[in-house]
């Protein structure tokens, strides 16, 4: 029943130099072209693909290998549906100095934004 773009307002606090992976779930479209946006500018992300969970459910990823101050900001994902751009709720990425203990805040309702996954 139409597009369902998941994502709840989230604040992520990450240590400088650490990786973070965000994800965005899109339901209700067979072939979404998922774009990531930071502070209003599209993030070019050619080596990050997205996963079909089912024919009408997709998850897009944005991987930041090593977060620096310039990466802090407001991120969201968007898709075009019938000529209109649908956008998710934003995630706010903030940084603490390298070596500090990072934590993240998460609103307690359903969200398809991942917690940061420190993989590197």
């Amino acid at each position: 029943a139409g597009l369902k773009l998941m994502g709840a307002p989230v604040k992520l606090t990450v240590s400088q130099g650490q990786p973070v992976k965000l994800n965005c779930s899109v339901e209700g479209m067979e072939e979404p072209d998922i774009q990531w946006v930071k502070d209003g500018a599209v993030v070019q992300n050619l080596d990050q693909l997205y996963i079909p969970v089912s024919e009408q459910h997709w998850i897009g990823f944005l991987s930041l290998k090593s977060v620096e101050r310039s990466d802090a900001g407001r991120y969201w994902c968007q898709v075009e549906d019938g000529g209109e751009t649908e956008i998710s709720q934003p995630v706010w990425l903030t940084l603490v100095p390298r070596g500090s203990s990072a934590h993240h805040h998460h609103h307690h309702h359903h969200s398809a934004w991942s917690h940061p996954q420190f993989e590197k």
């Epitope: 993030v43 050619l46 693909l49 620096e68 993989e119």
Partner: antibody
Framework: EVQLVQSGADVKKPGASLTISCQAS????????ISWVRQKPGKGLEWMGQ????????HYGPSFQGHVTISADRSTATAYLQWRSLEASDTAMYYC??????????????????WGPGTLVTVSS | SYELTQPPSVSVSPGQTARITCSGD??????AYWYQQKSGQAPVLVIY???KRISGIPERFSGSSSGTMATLTISGAQVEDEADYYC???????????FGGGTKLTVL
């Protein structure tokens, strides 16, 4: 089983047009992205560009922008690489590459690739 | 345009450790991928996102990255590892992909 079947070798004269193809089977074509990679004889790999299955969005390497066109026909699950005017320097092997990420039970995606066998293009007068 | 720099050749004896480097200004922020290409064959992806090994690739292949340098390490190189190896990553602006010039690994 995933397969990428590329069109056969071709010999053309400079200035001729050419389209080579890469037909996919074994998966839903629009689920994944296809890249084209050039390899001149005895030389290294060069990334030419990419087409994303959904919406057929394209991106090109700076050396190839304006010289080639990447397209796809979703109804036949085929990606294309097209030249309007070939040059001798286009002589090379051309590979199509399918990119895929999927999860195996967890939330962290695994990355896979499949390469076509390559199409040899020879441009000679 | 953005470039990734690799040594043209690396030689090791069987059983030794081979290290192939790749340098690029964007590598502190962009992941490196590594390909193996044996003579007359299509390339095969062995490492993605700096250090993740593709399923089916032997454990002797590993990847690492520090600053502007990514490294492919083959611990206990075998004769069958003789091939050309290419690094691959995203341009600084993230809008196109780039291969390194390739490194010929000789195991003799």
């Amino acid at each position: 089983e995933v397969q990428l079947v590329q069109s056969g070798a071709d010999v053309k004269k400079p200035g001729a047009s050419l389209t080579i193809s890469c037909q996919a089977s074994g998966y839903t074509f629009t689920d994944y992205w296809i890249s084209w990679v050039r390899q001149k004889p005895g030389k290294g790999l060069e990334w030419m560009g990419q087409i994303r299955g959904p919406a057929s969005a394209t991106h090109y390497g700076p050396s190839f922008q304006g010289h080639v066109t990447i397209s796809a026909d979703r109804s036949t699950a085929t990606a294309y690489l097209q030249w309007r005017s070939l040059e001798a320097s286009d002589t090379a092997m051309y590979y199509c590459v399918r990119h895929q990420q999927q999860t195996s039970g967890g939330t962290i995606p695994e990355y896979y690739q499949h390469w076509g066998p390559g199409t040899l293009v020879t441009v000679s007068s | 345009s953005y470039e990734l720099t690799q040594p043209p050749s690396v030689s090791v004896s069987p059983g030794q450790t081979a290290r192939i480097t790749c340098s690029g200004d964007a590598l502190p922020k962009k992941y490196a991928y590594w390909y193996q290409q044996k003579s007359g064959q299509a390339p095969v992806l062995v490492i993605y996102e700096d250090k993740k090994r593709i399923s089916g690739i032997p454990e002797r292949f590993s990847g690492s990255s520090s600053g502007t340098m990514a490294t492919l390490t083959i611990s206990g190189a075998q004769v069958e590892d003789e091939a050309d190896y290419y690094c691959y990553s995203t341009s600084t602006g993230g809008n196109y992909m780039v291969f390194g010039g390739g490194t010929k690994l000789t195991v003799l």
